[in-house]
């Protein structure tokens, strides 16, 4: 569209230049040309001449009517056919937009990634609006009643320096566009409860050459949080189903987790952690691929007949991947849980 145009007349839109998608729209063109009594007034949409639903109201004015206009954006202009002129003469032009009022923002979540110095809030915006929509994030201290507001397009990062007067806040998001305004539900936030530990990383893995080979996975984090609860999921690259083990971790030293895995197979490992007792998880770490060594002796391998890792807390569950090509986007589809206990020899309790 053309933002600035010298008009020789006027163009206006009913109900307005921004309107709800699917509405009936009338666009008027009124010429004010010198030395021209136009034979015809023409409408163009995105450069193409319109043929239908045009009404000549009087000598200077014409109207085009659209039933259920549903294009998000269009550039309209109108011209006059002046006697004695070879070309049509431009009268005026307008950018028009159609869209929807915003949905109420949903699933508002605020977290502080350790060491980031920011509180990051995200939300679901709902269905597309097709028009410029802004989000106003309200952060109100429950202790001082002071309110801060931040403009955003899809998420917001708020410096924790500006949240020093209080630990408890009420957060909500207001969605605003030309067609309406909606508020999210309010979220109660305690700054101490929303910290996500510094990223956990799997650094290496090795498989021992024992008669019953075991794989040791080494993983670490720079977190300063003392009590951390973690999950490690793993599967063969050919499998859809993840197994998940749970650990209480202390990152003052590198974590070692032992697995008894199928020989001569390529495995994918990922880990994620949260502060113990809190609800916000890290995203899963980058996939770490490890190839187990070939079987040395003839052994009938069974996935659940081997001792588990020797860790303080562990749970193994089956998790099925939606797609083997999307290791980061997995959903818990089944919930068969196997609890491992520190084993002596090959004895295994399953409860």
């Amino acid at each position: 569209g053309i933002t600035s145009i010298n008009c020789s007349g006027d163009m206006w839109v009913e109900p307005g230049e921004i309107f709800q998608m699917g509405m009936n729209v009338s666009i008027y063109c009124q010429e004010a040309l010198k030395h021209c009594r136009p034979r015809n007034l023409y409408f163009y949409k995105n450069g193409f001449k319109e043929e239908f639903d045009i009404t000549r109201i009087n000598r200077t004015t014409a109207r085009i009517w659209y039933k259920g206009f549903s294009e998000p954006h269009a550039y309209m202009h109108c011209t006059a056919e002046c006697p004695g002129h070879f070309q049509e003469t431009l009268i005026c032009g307008k950018d028009i937009s159609s869209g929807h009022p915003p949905d109420a923002p949903s699933n508002l979540t605020c977290v502080i990634y350790e060491y980031s110095g920011n509180m990051t809030c995200t939300w679901n915006t709902g269905k597309p609006t097709y028009i410029d929509t802004k989000y106003i994030v309200h952060v109100k201290s429950l202790e001082t009643e002071e309110e801060q507001q931040y403009l955003a397009s899809s998420y917001v990062k708020i410096s924790t320096d500006s949240l020093q007067g209080s630990r408890k806040y009420l957060v909500w998001v207001q969605a605003v566009n030309s067609l309406g305004m909606e508020n999210s539900q309010q979220l109660h936030v305690h700054l101490d409860d929303i910290v996500i530990p510094s990223a956990s990383i799997i650094s290496r893995a090795e498989t021992t050459n024992d008669t019953v080979p075991k794989t040791i996975v080494y993983w670490k984090s720079k977190t300063m949080i003392e009590k951390v609860f973690c999950e490690m999921r793993y599967k063969t690259t050919t499998n859809q189903t993840w197994s998940v083990k749970e650990f209480d971790a202390n990152f003052t030293y590198v974590q070692q987790s032992e697995f008894y895995l199928e020989p001569d197979s390529k495995y994918v490992f990922q880990v994620r952690c949260q502060e113990t007792g809190k609800r916000n998880w890290q995203p899963w770490s980058s996939p770490f691929v490890h190839q187990t060594s070939q079987e040395t002796g003839k052994r009938n391998w069974q996935p659940w007949s081997s001792p588990f890792v020797h860790q303080t807390s562990q749970t193994v569950s089956q998790v099925t991947a939606k797609s083997s090509h999307e290791p980061q986007k997995m959903e818990m589809l089944s919930a068969t849980i196997f609890r491992g206990h520190p084993a002596s020899g090959n004895h295994q309790d399953i409860g």
Epitope: Q148, Y150, L151, A152, V176
Partner: nanobody, 116 residues
Amino acid sequence: QVQLQESGGGSVQAGGSLTLSCTAPGFTFRLAAMRWVRQAPGKGLEWVSGIDSRGSTIYADSVKGRFTISKDNAKNTLYLQLNSLKTEDTAMYYCAQGVYGDTYSGSQGTQVTVSS
């Protein structure tokens, strides 16, 4: 309640420009989100523009591309630059706390009159 004070209004021809200011003694603009609202003769209050503590801005469609909101934290002052003024911009202009809303907190306002 913060006492806000607007200034800079006046009479101008259509197509002309003005800059409105809003100050508040003892008020820290650095952390504040602010807005401008206006009231045309015989009409209700209309939200015009807003700015958050970090300088992100939002505008009503009727003024987008013509008006610019800004603030100078060092001078504790909020501004509204009005360009390409139209007769329909004639109104009393008020500043208020908060990015968005068609209310103000009882300040005196500043009058803008645009003639054709």
